[in-house]
């Protein structure tokens, strides 16, 4: 058993059939020795007497809020938690696989430049009794300070029968040193409740690895005279890291018919813009990269040919 | 060329190559041998390689004030990297693939750490690490590792220089 | 499997350019890098350049810089070899070859002859 | 560029024969260096990789050794099949290149 949080406990359980459980001792916060009962959420029933409550927390109906009382007054709460292990392996019930980059992928973030400032989330199909927290760090054995705000739900879709409640966090590390190379990973931990059931999920990873830049942005076209050639150019996106002379992107322009069978034309630049064949019913669609590091490239930003 | 002594290299050369090393350490990485890395843990047989860190002048403003310190600093992480390549570590079984191209980096980890230091001139070096893994296994672990750091540094440096081309140039 | 399979056979007259096709198919095209290689009647083999399709970062044989530029169509895993500018000794049979080390996958050559 | 030498340019040989055929280059190369077989018609055929590696499907009667340098290709006992060309060709750096062919024919 440990402290999540003041008088929040986890109780850490190997699950199976006929497991023996955690024998457990609360002690009521209170000077008090004598007249003391204790009893569980809203029930009444007395659970026990005394300063200590020893009980065997076997299963969820053993967790809860356990209260201690003297002559009708509440001295002190202790709400107790489960965390699951089954065949060693912790619980992720409240989480959903998000299955990208590979399967196990609970947390994903996303960062738009080398500022140290990033962005992480995580789906669930709950909808209700669910509380989300936050921790990040840079490195584990000696920690560096990243500060996480509070959790909120940023998206809701339906995805078949049921909902999905998208939450994020954004976070930034507190001495950010952009034009360094990272050689130790940034932590993020995230601990979550619902109803009485405790899971934590982790993630870590190098900024630089889930770079992301923003779409590029002024997207224009110009024809060229006497020519179906047009010059096609954008600008760095306002988020990007600066200056552009030190962080680079690089850019791939698409030329793309309406039917998704059609040839699709791909040129590469480093330059911010381009010439390419403007064909009848096309879109011209940019998007950008890191230049010297392979992270993820950007959305598309897209015009119609016409 | 950057000599200790400190005149200026030839910035728009070692971009080009720099950018050119980017590429490389990319594409080499699939080709070392096939493993899912992340079950690993990282940093205990990488954290003896050269890392530019925040005090080396690597950024816009240090590279302002004196570029020396930077290109030191990548200079003897190139020389490590391009050792390690030299190595067993490399040239031991598991045979690296034959479509790799490893040999490309490996030249051109050298090219470039000559054109920051010409013949006769010598800064510091780092002393490379005995990285002798016995077992191929671990042997195909390190050359992951390795590369995957590589791409961080190269990555790095090729900013440098793709500034100090912009700005530093004469 | 891997196979390279490449365009056919052109007969082009001296000034003109010529664009060789080589389909890849059995591996994820943009992970290796591409390379032309090409041999002339009787001769050895000649390194042209090479491609990753990837970045579409590509280098060149001095003595073809400005003639030559290879590209490729990730979505059709075709990479293409254009020869501008064509002479008589650019008569040969040009190779695609997978990797940027050694070459274990081959196409199967495309003969390109340049006579007046 | 790095110049590669191929010696002997040709050479006759019977079945059962030991054959070497030598590869210097201008420079250091490290052990990057392959060996190639192509016969008439066809396109090359990878031998030996990494100066040493035997490529996959290649009969065990190939060898590759050296470093740096100088390299050699050994075919322990020749096979009516291994009348052909053979090439080295580097694969430190580019450009790549390639020697200048030995051609192997029967006495």
């Known amino acids: 058993i440990w402290e999540l949080k003041k008088d929040v406990y986890v109780v850490e359980l190997d699950w199976y059939p006929d497991a023996p459980g955690e024998m457990v001792v609360l002690t009521c916060d209170t000077p008090e020795e004598d007249g003391i009962t204790w009893t569980l959420d809203q029930s009444s029933e007395v659970l026990g007497s005394g300063k200590t409550l020893t009980i065997q927390v076997k299963e969820f109906g053993d967790a809860g809020q356990y209260t201690c009382h003297k002559g009708g007054e509440v001295l002190s709460h202790s709400l107790l938690l489960l965390h699951k292990k089954e065949d060693g392996i912790w619980s992720t019930d409240i989480l959903k696989d998000q299955k990208e980059p590979k399967n196990k992928t609970f947390l994903r973030c996303e960062a738009k430049n080398y500022s140290g400032r990033f962005t992480c989330w995580w789906l669930t199909t709950i909808s209700t009794d669910l509380t989300f927290s936050v921790k990040s760090s840079r490195g584990s054995s000696d920690p560096q300070g990243v500060t996480c705000g509070a959790a909120t739900l940023s998206a809701e879709r339906v995805r078949g029968d049921n909902k999905e409640y998208e939450y994020s966090v954004e976070c930034q590390e507190d001495s950010a040193c952009p034009a360094a190379e990272e050689s130790l990973p940034i932590e993020v931990m995230v601990d979550a409740v619902h109803k009485l059931k405790y899971e934590n999920y982790t993630s870590s990873f190098f900024i630089r690895d889930i770079i992301k830049p923003d779409p590029p942005k002024n997207l224009q076209l110009k024809p060229l005279k006497n020519s179906r050639q047009v010059e096609v150019s954008w600008e760095y996106p306002d988020t990007w890291s600066t200056p552009h002379s030190y962080f680079s992107l690089t850019f791939c322009v698409q030329v793309q018919g309406k039917s998704k069978r059609e040839k699709k034309d791909r040129v590469f630049t480093d330059k911010t813009s381009a010439t390419v064949i403007c064909r009848k019913n096309a879109s011209i669609s940019v998007r950008a990269q890191d230049r010297y590091y392979s992270s993820s490239w950007s959305e598309w930003a897209s015009v119609p040919c016409s | 060329r950057a000599v200790p002594g400190g005149s200026s290299p030839a910035w728009t050369q070692c971009q080009q190559l720099s950018q050119k090393l980017c590429t490389l350490a990319w594409s080499a990485h699939p080709l070392v041998g096939h493993m899912d890395l992340r079950e690993e843990g990282d940093e205990e047989t990488t954290n003896d390689v050269p890392h530019i860190q925040c005090g080396d002048g690597c950024d816009p403003q240090g590279l302002r004030d004196n570029s020396q310190f930077c290109l030191q600093r990548i200079h003897q992480g190139l020389i490590f990297y391009e050792k390690l390549l030299g190595s067993d570590i490399f040239t031991g079984e598991p045979s690296l693939l034959p479509d790799s191209p490893v040999g490309q980096l490996h030249a051109s980890l050298l090219g470039l750490s000559q054109l920051l230091q010409p013949e006769g001139h010598h800064w510091e070096t780092q002393q490379i690490p005995s990285l002798s893994p016995s077992q191929p296994w671990q042997r195909l672990l390190l050359r992951f590792k390795i590369l995957r750091s590589l791409q961080a540094f190269v990555a790095v440096a090729a900013r440098v220089f793709a500034h100090g081309a912009a700005t530093l140039s004469p | 499997q891997v196979q390279l399979v490449q365009s056919g056979a052109e007969v082009k007259k001296p000034g003109a350019s010529v664009k060789v096709s080589c389909k890849a198919s059995?591996?994820?095209?943009?992970?290796?890098?591409m390379t032309w290689v090409r041999q002339a009647p009787g001769q050895g083999l000649e390194w042209m350049g090479q491609i990753f399709p990837a970045s579409g970062s590509a280098d060149y044989a001095q003595k073809l810089q400005g003639r030559v530029t290879m590209t490729t169509d990730t979505s059709t895993s075709t990479a293409y070899m254009e020869l501008r500018s064509l002479r008589s000794d650019d008569t040969a049979v040009y190779y695609c070859?997978?990797?940027?080390?050694?070459?274990?996958?081959w196409g199967q050559g495309t003969l390109v002859t340049v006579s007046s | 560029d790095i110049q590669m030498t191929q010696s002997p340019s040709s050479l006759s040989a019977s079945v059962g024969d030991r054959v070497t055929i030598t590869c210097r280059t201008s420079e250091n190369i490290y052990s990057y260096l392959a060996w190639y077989q192509q016969k008439p018609g066809k396109a090359p055929k990878l031998l030996i990789y990494?100066?040493?590696t035997l490529a996959e499907g290649v009969p065990s009667r190939f060898s590759g050794s050296g470093s740096g340098t100088d390299f050699t290709l050994t075919i322990s006992s020749l096979q009516p099949e291994d009348f052909a060309t053979y090439y080295c060709q580097h694969h430190y750096g580019i450009p790549f290149t390639f020697g200048q062919g030995t051609k192997v024919e029967i006495k």
């Open positions: 070859a997978r990797g940027g080390g050694g070459f274990a996958y």
């Open positions: 990494n100066a040493k």
């Open positions: 059995g591996y994820i095209f943009i992970t290796y890098w």
